[in-house]
């Protein structure tokens, strides 16, 4: 069959018909519908929403829509024993207690089942002791404390401000430093943009607002009790002591009103420099302990949360491909929220809903995509990407053979300034070409393309006239598809101006104030940014599912591989004598990159010239493109991180949200001067160079002429 036989719409109009069907008003309506009550993972409300979405996707015209359920470890506060933190005097009396809940936003005072702020998967405990302020609790913050300031966190309760890195990394760092508890708080320096009012009068965080979130260090494992395998009816579950990634010390989040009360009494060392000061009217002393008059007072945590195996539900919709039904393009985003999910995730779920509706409309008119499109509404993303990971574990054999691409669809907005894209280099040209065809929603760019406004506002640091596209890290549902399975992946959303707004994420992230009204009043009243994101995400899915030749350009991978090789080499060259002493050479890696570049170039030439009417040759070339991402997977995984298997990219070991290139080599080199046994440490660097060079060379060979 030619690719047109599947459709009664001419190829030129396919994409246009799909994009024209997307409506801002529908996204707005769907967002409202999805945000009226909380949809916490594992609750009846979220199950009901799953069934509603299943029903609506069927109505929209998908071929099949099924629920896929799993029984995974979740975490909830104890309803009768609330979590809180207190200051206690020498007699053990509680002289100050933190809030038990956030003041509800206007109009939501009578909503039940709002989960109070908590750190999901915190163990129970009531530690008491002196406080140490650890800034953002990053690796470098603990280096500063322990190495430069000689401050020992062992046996202390640490207080860290949210921001810069994933909260799970903060907790891991605190544990390694010997802390016995962690208090996380939102500092106005990071969560209160100057000149903007706090909610409900603006989009800033009020003093009583608190960020919820999980504090796991799963490293891609999914359900902590069933790593590597689906949490199904016959699953063998680990004991809680063997569970993956659980924190070992109590953790609790607070807002900045409560943080003020703890930090204002801090004594001990002064902050080492201005980068350790936030915006509260407190000295930001590091401690340990309180100052003079208050030195006999201690901090006590009261944490009573419980971990429970609970059923979760993914919704999986299928639109069968007409020509290559065994090739899957996946659009997925999560449905579960901490509270109302006004931005995270429902601004994304509403966009997915409208994309499904548009595809369904085309299908009802007789059109089908060339390849199968799978739509997913994931559950329990907030508890560690559990729904997506369990489904991928259950379907891994199909996915690794049939998975063409995964497009993620969490929050559509984190600001309203410009587009933000993170994706595999294979998708760079797809994203560039698509955004050149879409209209910019930005003020001052009327009649201009999205590509133009995006490039102007977020230029590439390397290539003039091109927009910035970032590496994929983690912290969202693409993780299992990209980092574990090696399926080409991408994500897009509208973002803030990172130059002028240095706060982390958006201020109301994971708080009770993330409501429909937040979006409708302050972020996107016309829902034009949501529509643009729908066009980008939907357009990518459309092209990936419908283009005759897969819209992947392997030459872009060659370019970044050279850049990443240069970067890691320059890091290593900070140790010239050791490179000489231990005979460390990057020649094999640079040689492999050179070979990849040459082979990719030849492959691209063949791609222009081959006979596209020959279905066998077409399928062969497309398979080489599809399997290229897969070729970067090392079946053994990265050291101590078996589910991070991509050799070119992995989540940073110091910040799950960030992507790191050549992560095996990077981690081997990190802080290498502090390793006690240099011969062993440099031996591991050499091994990682070998693994990387072999992988790049092996990937290159998958693009060679097959015979």
């Amino acid at each position: 069959k030619s690719s047109n036989e599947a459709t009664n719409i001419t190829p030129k109009h396919n994409m246009k018909a799909f994009l024209d069907e997307l409506k801002a008003e529908n996204i707005k309506k769907f967002l409202y519908n999805f945000t009226q009550i909380p949809h916490l993972a594992g609750t009846e409300q979220n199950f009901q929403l799953a069934k509603q979405i299943q029903s609506q996707w069927k109505e929209f015209g998908l071929d099949s829509v099924e629920l896929a359920h799993y029984d995974v470890l979740l975490s909830y506060p104890n309803k009768t024993h609330p979590n809180y933190i207190s200051i206690i005097n020498e007699d053990g009396n509680e002289i100050f207690n933190t809030s038990l809940f956030e003041p509800p936003p206007p109009g939501y005072e009578n909503v039940s089942d709002i989960v109070p702020p908590f750190s999901a998967f915190s163990p129970q405990g009531m530690p008491e002791g002196d406080l140490v302020y650890v800034n953002y609790a990053r690796t470098e913050d603990f280096f500063k404390l322990e190495r430069d300031m000689k401050i020992n966190c062992s046996g202390k309760i640490v207080i860290a401000r949210y921001g810069k890195v994933f909260r799970g990394n903060k907790v891991k760092n605190a544990q390694l430093a010997g802390a016995k508890g962690v208090i996380l708080y939102s500092d106005p320096a990071d969560y209160f943009a100057p000149g903007v009012k706090s909610y409900p009068d603006g989009w800033n965080l009020p003093g009583g607002g608190v960020q919820r979130g999980n504090i796991l260090n799963l490293n891609g494992a999914g359900d902590p009790l069933t790593p590597g395998y689906p949490a199904n009816e016959y699953a063998y579950r680990r004991g809680i002591a063997e569970a993956v990634g659980l924190p070992s010390i109590p953790v609790h989040p607070i807002g900045y009103y409560d943080a003020q009360k703890l930090l204002e009494k801090m004594g001990g060392s002064a902050p080492p420099d201005s980068s350790w000061r936030g915006s509260l009217k407190v000295p930001y002393n590091v401690g340990p302990g309180f100052t003079g008059n208050f030195s006999t007072q201690k901090v006590k945590m009261h944490i009573h949360s419980t971990n429970e195996v609970t059923r979760i539900y993914n919704v999986i919709g299928t639109l069968r491909g007409a020509v290559e039904p065994d090739r899957y393009v996946i659009l997925g985003g999560h449905r579960d929220s901490w509270v109302f999910g006004g931005i995270d995730p429902q601004s994304g779920a509403a966009v997915v809903h409208e994309i499904v509706r548009s595809f369904g409309t085309l299908k009802k008119e007789g059109w089908r995509p060339r390849r199968t499109i799978l739509f997913a509404s994931w559950d329990a993303e907030e508890f560690g990407l559990l729904g997506s990971t369990e489904w991928a574990e259950e379907n891994s054999r199909l996915l690794q053979e049939r998975g063409v691409a995964y497009i993620n669809a969490d929050s559509s907005i984190e600001g309203n300034y410009t587009l933000r894209v993170d994706c595999t280099p294979l998708m760079y040209s797809l994203v560039h070409n698509l955004t050149k065809e879409l209209k910019s929603p930005d003020e001052g760019f009327e009649g201009k393309s999205l590509y133009e406004s995006w490039t102007k506002k977020s230029p590439s640091p390397e290539f003039s006239g091109m927009p910035r596209i970032s590496k994929l890290g983690s912290g969202n549902d693409f993780e299992v598809f990209f980092q574990r399975l090696g399926i080409a992946s991408g994500r897009a959303r509208y973002t803030k101006n990172w130059e002028t707004n240095k706060f982390s994420g958006y201020p109301l992230y994971h708080s009770v104030y993330e409501t429909y009204e937040l979006v409708e009043k302050f972020y996107d009243p016309m829902f034009k940014y949501h529509l643009t994101v729908a066009q980008v995400r939907g357009g990518m899915v459309f092209e990936l599912a419908n283009s005759i030749v897969l819209p992947f350009d392997c030459r872009d991978y060659a370019v970044v591989l050279r850049k990443y090789a240069d970067k890691i080499y320059s890091i290593s060259m900070k140790h010239p004598q050791e490179m000489k002493t231990y005979s460390v050479s990057f020649d094999s890696l640079f040689s492999a990159v050179k070979n990849f570049t040459e082979i990719a170039s030849k492959f691209s030439e063949r791609l222009q010239d081959f006979d596209k009417s020959n279905p066998i040759v077409l399928r062969m070339m497309n398979d080489q493109l599809m399997f290229l991402e897969r070729a970067f997977i090392d079946p053994l995984g990265l050291p101590d991180r078996p589910f991070y298997r991509h050799v070119i990219y992995a989540p940073s070991s110091h910040n799950k949200y960030a992507g790191e290139s050549f992560p095996g080599i990077y981690d081997a080199l990190f802080d290498i001067e502090s390793k006690v046994d240099p011969s062993k440490a440099w031996g591991e660097v050499k091994r990682q160079i070998y693994v990387a060079a072999f992988t790049v060379q092996a990937a290159a060979e998958t693009l060679s002429e097959v015979a």
């Epitope: 190495r147 430069d148 000689k150 062992s154 900070k574 502090s674 006690v676």
Partner: antibody
Framework: EVKLEESGGGLVQPGGSMKISCVAS????????MNWVRQTPEKGLEWVAE??????????HYAESVKGRVIISRDDSKSSVYLQMNSLRAEDTAVYYC???????WGQGTTVTVSS | NIVMTQFPKSMSASAGERMTLTCKAS??????VSWYQQKPTQSPKMLIY???NRFTGVPDRFSGSGSGTDFILTISSVQAEDLVDYYC?????????FGGGTKLEMK
Amino acid sequence: EVKLEESGGGLVQPGGSMKISCVASGFTFSNYWMNWVRQTPEKGLEWVAEIRSQSNNFATHYAESVKGRVIISRDDSKSSVYLQMNSLRAEDTAVYYCTRRWNNFWGQGTTVTVSS
Amino acid sequence: NIVMTQFPKSMSASAGERMTLTCKASENVGTYVSWYQQKPTQSPKMLIYGASNRFTGVPDRFSGSGSGTDFILTISSVQAEDLVDYYCGQSYTFPYTFGGGTKLEMK
């Protein structure tokens, strides 16, 4: 191969001064924290001082027994670390070893004798 | 200051025997403990770091264990060249401190 070579030891009178040196080779000296450790038959091994790398602002730390009397310094261009010892006492008599961070590599030592 | 106490001060061994040397810290030092071997007229050489990791080039008859306050160096089958002095040391906090040493002698 990592090598540390101390020099400059000898006999000095109580109250006198002495500067001992250590030249390093086989590693990128500027990245590493360096220590002086001394050894006597009576007291055994005793850590004396540490100097950190440029990325740690060349921070220095001293044992209480020598604080105010010794200064540790380094010259990364010469891959050298020094220990300037003032107001020397009989109890400072020892073999002084230059060591790399974590005391994973030691020089052969230089003997300092404080005696009248 | 953290005091590192080694005992016994000396012990006798025959070739092929299994020997256990003990080091006790006066307070918790995690696993920041190293063991050193010193031969006559030579400087100390690292054997074990991080309480249980064998340093490069050290024969596998040497092993370390322990955490917190109690640490052990084990020589599974003593050789003649092992009959020298052994020291433990902590790098957990300032000032870095060493034990008084254990001398292994011929039985």
